[in-house]
Amino acid sequence: DLKVEMMAGGTQITPLNDNVTIFCNIFYSQPLNITSMGITWFWKSLTFDKEVKVFEFFGDHQEAFRPGAIVSPWRLKSGDASLRLPGIQLEEAGEYRCEVVVTPLKAQGTVQLEVVASPASRLLLDQVGMKENEDKYMCESSGFYPEAINITWEKQTQKFPHPIEISEDVITGPTIKNMDGTFNVTSCLKLNSSQEDPGTVYQCVVRHASLHTPLRSNFTLTAARHSLSETEKTDNFS
């Protein structure tokens, strides 16, 4: 009996530019002789329904149809037919199929590969055109994929140390697509510093599929206006 097992759940998520290993394990009732077996990996794009050969291994012959693609003969001896793709790109997401032949038996499995890019986040203070005692804080999130992203603002005061979500005076712009396929978005918070307590901590909170935990960038309101430090203005908070 010949069986192939792919990633549990049928989906594998990988970061953009990672050297991804797409898992495929072979279960066979006898020891594997790699000189008399074949492995073929196929890819089907998300955008068109055509299957393309990525890698082929037969006996001593192996061929990569995608540059850098590799199945390890050393790993194969232990039943591991995983495919390694160095420097994975967004457009390489889709369905991957691992087909194993141990004559006369054939087995296959498929997995969906999702490629994600994590946002970088930074806070900026924009004073241009603002009225007296009014500040506009911008939270820029850039380089993320997929497009869906959630940006919220929270504040913590000395009276209320638990974060409170701010819903007023928040404007989040449209997402902008970059040349490389990733996205950028900016969310703005308008503050009237004369009405806010010094020591209040404000946070821009970014939630995205690529992040295990939300990305938080914060600043503290001090007695003086425009309390953002230089690092807070320009640093990447990721």
Epitope: T21, F23, R75, K77, G79, S82
Partner: antibody, heavy 119, light 107 residues
Framework: QVQLVQSGAEVKKPGASVKVSCKAS????????IHWVRQAPGQGLEWMGW????????NYAQNFQGRVTMTRDTSISTAYMELSRLRSDDAAVYYC????WGSGTFNIWGQGTMVTVSS | AIQMTQSPSSLSASVGDRVTITCRAS??????LGWFQQRPGKAPNLLIY???SLESGVPSRFSGRGSGTDFTLTISSLQPEDFATYYC?????????FGGGTKVEIK
């Protein structure tokens, strides 16, 4: 950067067990096999086995079969090697090492964990 | 298990010397062989994989040759930092086995 950080030195009595940890960082933990290699004082290198962090599959050298257990916790990117029924000749530096993808060579090594077995 | 016999077990050489270390496998291992350098008190460091491929970041004075059962590691011009112990490793078959090591000492 890519690195493996091992737990600290251990002193054990004969017959006891030791569990050494190996924390990976800077790469996708599940994508590369972790091997364990030991080196007795003044001696050469001895391969103990490997674990596939993705599947948990293992392959142990015959010498250690029945005494060694290799496990992993993918949530904290850590591999473990437990050796039981320790003897005085198990005193050695134990290394974890990451494979160079798809070959049996190892291009990233932990700093080593000294295990002393003494009554 | 495949036996890996390394020779010599030790050698003395001077800076600038050309040094060759040999590793012989007890059966055909194709080119599934690696070479490691180990300095005292440190973890080994991969020099060569697949018998002749230089690991990235390793100086080009190190080279590997061979296929089947006979393999060599050559250091074309020995440098002060090359005084160390060298090991070969076969990964053609389980269990993986190391050679006994070659200690390169200062003459």
């Amino acid at each position: 950067q890519v690195q493996l950080v091992q737990s600290g030195a251990e002193v054990k009595k004969p017959g006891a067990s030791v569990k050494v940890s190996c924390k990976a960082s800077g790469y996708t933990f599940t994508g590369y096999y972790i091997h364990w290699v030991r080196q007795a004082p003044g001696q050469g290198l001895e391969w103990m086995g490997w674990i596939n962090p993705h599947s948990g599959a293992t392959n142990y050298a015959q010498n250690f079969q029945g005494r060694v257990t290799m496990t992993r916790d993918t949530s904290i990117s850590t591999a473990y090697m437990e050796l039981s029924r320790l003897r005085s000749d198990d005193a050695a530096v134990y290394y974890c090492a990451r494979e160079r993808w798809g070959s049996g060579t190892f291009n990233i090594w932990g700093q080593g964990t000294m295990v002393t077995v003494s009554s | 298990a495949i036996q890996m016999t390394q020779s010599p077990s030790s050698l003395s050489a001077s800076v600038g010397d050309r040094v060759t270390i040999t590793c012989r496998a007890s059966q055909d291992i194709r080119n599934d062989l690696g070479w490691f350098q180990q300095r005292p008190g440190k973890a080994p460091n991969l020099l060569i994989y697949a018998a002749s491929s230089l690991e990235s970041g390793v100086p080009s004075r190190f080279s590997g040759r061979g296929s089947g059962t006979d393999f060599t590691l050559t250091i074309s011009s020995l440098q002060p930092e090359d005084f160390a112990t060298y090991y070969c490793l076969q990964y053609y078959n389980h269990p993986l086995t190391f050679g006994g090591g070659t200690k390169v000492e200062i003459k």
